[in-house]
């Protein structure tokens, strides 16, 4: 297993609809042809992994169908969307990079993106 | 070394606008969030509101909404804090910092007046 | 919005002695999200803990956080000259984010 850098951004504010997107960006040292990402969530000392995908360079990443992430690829780039997002669900993304094939095993894994998620102020009762 | 300057002081009448800049250097601007916090002469912090510069997104203090607007120029690498309709009590050092778990970059701060 | 209390207002030590500030929460924060800041007269806060008990870059080790849910501490095991000045808690766990009033630790 050899390692490899990934970037992300240091922090994202979800948007008011509970959406986050960023860029996961990894330093290809070779032609990988098949790649895995996943997202592990950090939170109170307790690591998650909230989705994971495996793409073949140059295809779309294919998560499962009731994943709450979805992304796309360009490069050495993902671009992952995670949806859904409460306020308990803030915490720290980390993005893990597989180059799995062809050999060797390269392995990645980011610093984190910490998510802000606020919660939409309640609408005030209306009489109409 | 990161670096975070903000503009310079300034006196407005109440009612008026004020816009205070802070331009980051040193670092991936859009990589983090700022963070802006008041304090009035003698008086304890008091924390406005933030934006993500990586996205825009912004979250404000209940009782500024509607008078605060956060921006940020990525061309520039500077944010902006908008405060309208000024009355007495806006008279405080406005900082800016940079964000992520607490704010562990400030600004100089910017003393804005407000006074008739 | 979370109320954030800092106790006591003031504090008088000596150089050399322990320091234990408190901030006390009106609900129940995520340890995660509870940071404390030292403040000097005409300048700007500097971010000391992060997350309750993280230290930030290059804050010495006699500065150390604690707590959970309503009550949190940062202690200063020896007082030194440049230690005394204003400390702030601020929580960002639930929006509104708040900060507390204040302690402020004076030589005796």
């Known amino acids: 297993c050899k390692a490899m850098h990934v970037a992300q951004p240091a922090v994202v504010l979800a948007s008011s609809r509970g959406i986050a997107s960023f860029v996961c960006e990894y330093a290809s040292p070779g032609k990988a042809t098949e790649v895995r990402v996943t997202v592990l969530r950090q939170a109170d000392s307790q690591v998650t992994e909230v989705c994971a995908a495996t793409y073949m360079m140059g295809n779309e990443l294919t998560f499962l169908d009731d994943s709450i992430c979805t992304g796309t690829s360009s490069g050495n780039q993902v671009n992952l969307t995670i949806q859904g997002l409460r306020a308990m669900d803030t915490g720290l993304y980390i993005c893990k990079v597989e180059l799995m094939y062809p050999p060797p095993y390269y392995l990645g894994i980011g610093n984190g993106t910490q998510i802000y998620v606020i919660d939409p102020e309640p609408c005030p009762d209306s009489d109409f | 070394q990161v670096q975070l300057v903000q503009s310079g002081a300034e006196v407005k009448k109440p009612g008026a606008s004020v816009k205070v800049s802070c331009k980051a250097s040193?670092?991936?601007?859009?990589?983090?969030?700022i963070s802006w916090v008041r304090q009035a002469p003698g008086q304890g912090l008091e924390w406005m509101g933030w934006?993500?510069?990586?996205?825009?997104?912004?979250n404000y203090a209940q009782k500024l909404q509607g008078r605060v607007t956060m921006t940020t120029d990525t061309s520039t690498s500077t944010a902006y804090m908008e405060l309208r309709s000024l009355r007495s009590d806006d008279t405080a050092v406005y900082y800016c910092?940079?964000?992520?778990?607490?704010?562990?970059?400030w600004g100089q701060g910017t003393l804005v007046t407000v006074s008739s | 919005e979370i109320v954030l209390t800092q106790s006591p207002g003031t504090l008088s030590l000596s150089p050399g002695e322990r320091a234990t500030l408190s901030c006390r929460a009106s609900?129940?924060?995520?340890?995660?999200?509870l940071a404390w800041y030292q403040q000097k007269p005409g300048q700007a806060p500097r971010l000391l803990i992060y997350g309750a008990s993280s230290r930030a870059t290059g804050i010495p080790d006699r500065f150390s956080g604690s707590g959970s849910g309503t009550d949190f501490t940062l202690t200063i095991s020896r007082l030194e000259p440049e230690d005394f000045a204003v400390y702030h808690c601020q929580q960002y766990g639930r929006s509104p984010w708040t900060l507390g009033q204040g302690t402020k630790v004076e030589i005796k």
């Open positions: 609900q129940s924060v995520s340890s995660s999200y």
């Open positions: 910092g940079r964000w992520v778990r607490g704010v562990e970059y």
């Open positions: 040193g670092y991936t601007f859009t990589s983090y969030g």
């Open positions: 934006i993500s510069a990586y996205n825009g997104n912004t």
